[in-house]
């Protein structure tokens, strides 16, 4: 093994390098010293390092490591952050268009139901947005509410338009009758199934992307231990103490040190792999009734069909409801 | 059938109803994201190697530093000697992950569980139990998808035809990462960038 080159007799090189790290220099010895107080860069002979310099090197080493880690994850972080934002906005656009489609369907096919229908449709799609963003709303409740609200308007405006104003008191009775008589057939249930499946998948997709950001942010801002700081210092800076400014760490040695410093972070690997593969599986299944774009943009048509179903059975329904709600002002409908 | 004229759109610039074959759709964008994410599947296991390759390491030099002394790059001492009589590397590994890392692992386990639960098994996209109560007068078939947009002729086809790039102010090209131009080339697209 070749002998190490003699250390800089004046510590001049070490001083000029250290000055870049810590302007103001009172810590670099003029000439090599025994260095008995050193704890990391343990000297085999005279050294150009002091205890204070060692502390500064440790701090710098840990900072370097943090920067390396942040730059390592920059592309990945950018990818997930930007996609999370894009998908969230895209989903909101889908919801907005689904609402527009549905409102236009009412305006063109059932103008007498507006503006009440617009209000109910608006509330329904607001709930859809809230659900996608993680609010605790039950989809079945949302759909039931839409049909509960629509039926009294459909009944009083389309099926029985001659009702006097005082008969509007029957709205509560009509809400109850809507469910008991299944006036919309199986359409509410159909919509519940389609909407809940597509929205659940959409919501978990967004949640997963946001967690991806959280994972990267967590590992991005890890504070490395003192032990790790000492290892990094020994690898990156202790050679300077011997005046070996241009020497680089051995590759194998670097890998061993990094694996030591990163032991905790690397434990994420297994779950990270699983995360990406599970997300892929989810995405592969996001079509037809599991695709919110497909489901929501087709809702106006299903709602239209459900109203047609009511109209088709209007005669039978009007008779039944007439009997059922005749005395709704005197008694409570249950 | 549900009459739906185009002139009712509030922001037509976003929603193109025309059947454009290669339009960007949400599903294509999702698949594109997954492909990009898969190139980062080994991100965490590759980190130690990545950091070594992006920090000063002896590559072409004959001699290198092993933490204690100058040694020949291919000697046994290149990896080992620097570790002797110093704090125990094994101990460092045995400490286990930091609490924040343990927390994030728990969250990952939870989301992975949810993702697996939500994933649609192949060949079972349609739930047959929907019609347990039966539709009257044949409103929909067994396949509940038939009910989507089942309003007959002239019904606007709305399957995956939103053009989001028109409205979204984002461009997903990763080349546009601020400051990416002065950074190192990614290794195997695994992880990129750093300072020296």
């Amino acid at each position: 093994q070749p002998p190490p080159p003699p250390p800089d007799a004046t510590c001049h090189q070490v001083r000029s390098f250290f000055q870049r790290l810590q302007p103001g220099l009172k810590w670099v010895p003029e000439t090599p010293v025994p260095g008995s107080d050193l704890q990391v860069c343990l000297p085999k002979g005279p050294t150009c390092c002091s205890r204070k310099m060692e502390e500064k090197y440790q701090l710098t080493a840990r900072l370097n490591m943090e920067q390396l880690l942040q730059s390592a994850s920059m592309e990945l972080k950018f990818l997930i952050i930007q996609n999370a934002a894009v998908f969230q906005e895209a989903f909101e656009i889908v919801v907005r268009h689904a609402k527009n489609y549905t409102n236009a369907m009412f305006k063109n096919n059932y103008p007498s139901l507006t503006p009440q229908a617009f209000e109910f449709v608006g509330e329904f799609f607001t709930d859809v947005s809230l659900y996608i963003l993680g609010s605790d709303i039950n989809v079945d409740d949302m759909v039931n509410e839409l049909f509960d609200s629509l039926f009294p308007v459909i009944y009083t405006q389309l099926m029985n338009p001659g009702l006097p104003d005082s008969a509007l008191d029957i709205n509560e009775c009509l809400r109850g009758a809507r469910r008991d008589l299944k006036v919309f057939g199986n359409f509410p249930k159909l919509i519940m199934t389609q909407v809940s499946k597509s929205l659940q998948v959409t919501r978990i997709f967004l949640q997963a992307l946001n967690l991806g950001i959280e994972v990267i942010n967590t590992t991005d801002h890890l504070k490395f231990s003192k032990d790790c700081g000492r290892m990094l210092t020994r690898m990156w800076y202790c050679s300077y103490c011997q005046g070996l400014m241009m020497v680089k760490p051995c590759g194998g040695y670097c890998n061993v040190v990094m694996q030591g410093c990163m032991a905790g972070v690397v434990e994420i690997d297994k779950y990270w792999r699983e995360y990406i593969l599970s997300l892929e599986e989810l995405v592969n299944g996001m079509y037809r009734i599991y695709d919110m774009e497909n489901v929501l943009l087709g809702l106006f048509s299903t709602i239209h069909d459900s109203i047609q179903y009511v109209q088709k059975n209007a005669g039978k329904l009007t008779t039944t409801i007439g009997k059922l709600c005749a005395h709704s002002q005197q008694r409570q409908y249950r | 059938s549900a009459y739906y004229p185009e002139d009712l759109f509030i922001d037509k610039k976003v929603l193109k109803v025309a059947h454009v074959e290669h339009e960007e759709t949400l599903s294509s964008r999702r698949r594109e994201l997954i492909q990009k994410l898969k190139s980062f599947i080994s991100f965490y296991s590759a980190l130690p190697g990545y950091i070594c390759s992006h920090s000063p390491v002896a590559e072409n030099d004959t001699l290198c530093w092993n933490g204690q002394e100058l040694v020949e790059r291919y000697s046994q001492k290149a990896a080992r000697n620097g570790m002797k009589n110093q704090f125990n590397l094994h101990e460092l590994k045995m400490k286990g992950p930091e609490p924040v890392v343990s927390q994030i692992i728990d969250k990952l386990k939870h989301i992975n569980q949810l993702l697996r639960t939500m994933s649609v098994p192949k060949g079972r996209v349609l739930d047959k139990n929907l019609d347990e109560e039966g539709f009257e007068s044949g409103d929909c078939g067994d396949d509940e998808d038939e009910c989507i947009g089942g309003s007959g002729d002239g019904m606007m086809k709305v399957k995956n035809q939103l053009r989001f790039l028109a409205e979204l102010a984002y461009d997903l090209d990763v080349d546009d990462v601020p400051g990416n131009n002065q950074q190192a080339t990614p290794k195997d697209n695994e992880i990129s960038t750093f300072h020296n």
């Epitope: 509330e123 709303i137 409740d141 | -």
Partner: antibody
Framework: QVQLQESGGGLVQPGRSLRLSCAAS????????MHWVRQAPGKGLEWVSA????????YYADSVEGRFTISRDNSKNTLYLQMNSLRAEDTAVYYC??????????????WGQGTLVTVSS | QSALTQPPSASGSPGQSVTISCTGT?????????VSWYQQYPGKAPKLLIY???NRPSGVPDRFSGSKSGTSASLAITGLQAEDGADYYC??????????FGGGTKVTVLG
Amino acid sequence: QVQLQESGGGLVQPGRSLRLSCAASGFTFSSYAMHWVRQAPGKGLEWVSAISSSGRSTYYADSVEGRFTISRDNSKNTLYLQMNSLRAEDTAVYYCAKDRRGSHADALNVWGQGTLVTVSS
Amino acid sequence: QSALTQPPSASGSPGQSVTISCTGTSSDVGGYNYVSWYQQYPGKAPKLLIYGNSNRPSGVPDRFSGSKSGTSASLAITGLQAEDGADYYCQSYDSSLRVVFGGGTKVTVLG
């Protein structure tokens, strides 16, 4: 006519439990979200809890989370609030209120007259 | 969850106008969420005045109007009358769908 009638209030010692009930009439109870709101003497309104029309979703204020439980029986048109581990600061008039929406909280368009709960040793 | 911010008091002479503000955050008033306003007389249950930011339930005089902009909402009472002297509360819900009330504003009709 739409009505809500609370019952079950009274004097109770700290740490003990109490169950409030609210009987609803004049509307389709199973179609609407329901709430409990309280008002301490001389103070403003403080929302306590809500439940969706089906009872599948429940919501609580931070101050009562884990101690109070809201529930409903749609077949009996009745709303309940089970209050455990009561504290002096839970002393208030408790109002039962009907929401104008069914799936979640929005606007409370019908209120009961309130029942007084006093927590004191 | 924190309460919405309202001024503790407001006053005006009969026939004048009074506006009460209600300030929240992006997760309640500023989100998708709607603002409601209530009127309460001493010893009585509150009564809904405005829902969905600006809608009046039937029976509420059109002297009462509501509006919302960003994270703030306001209730305007025009042509103030003696019976308008009461406590007024704004209310919204946060992103977790939990209801949040304002601290209340006492409106005094002078003279």
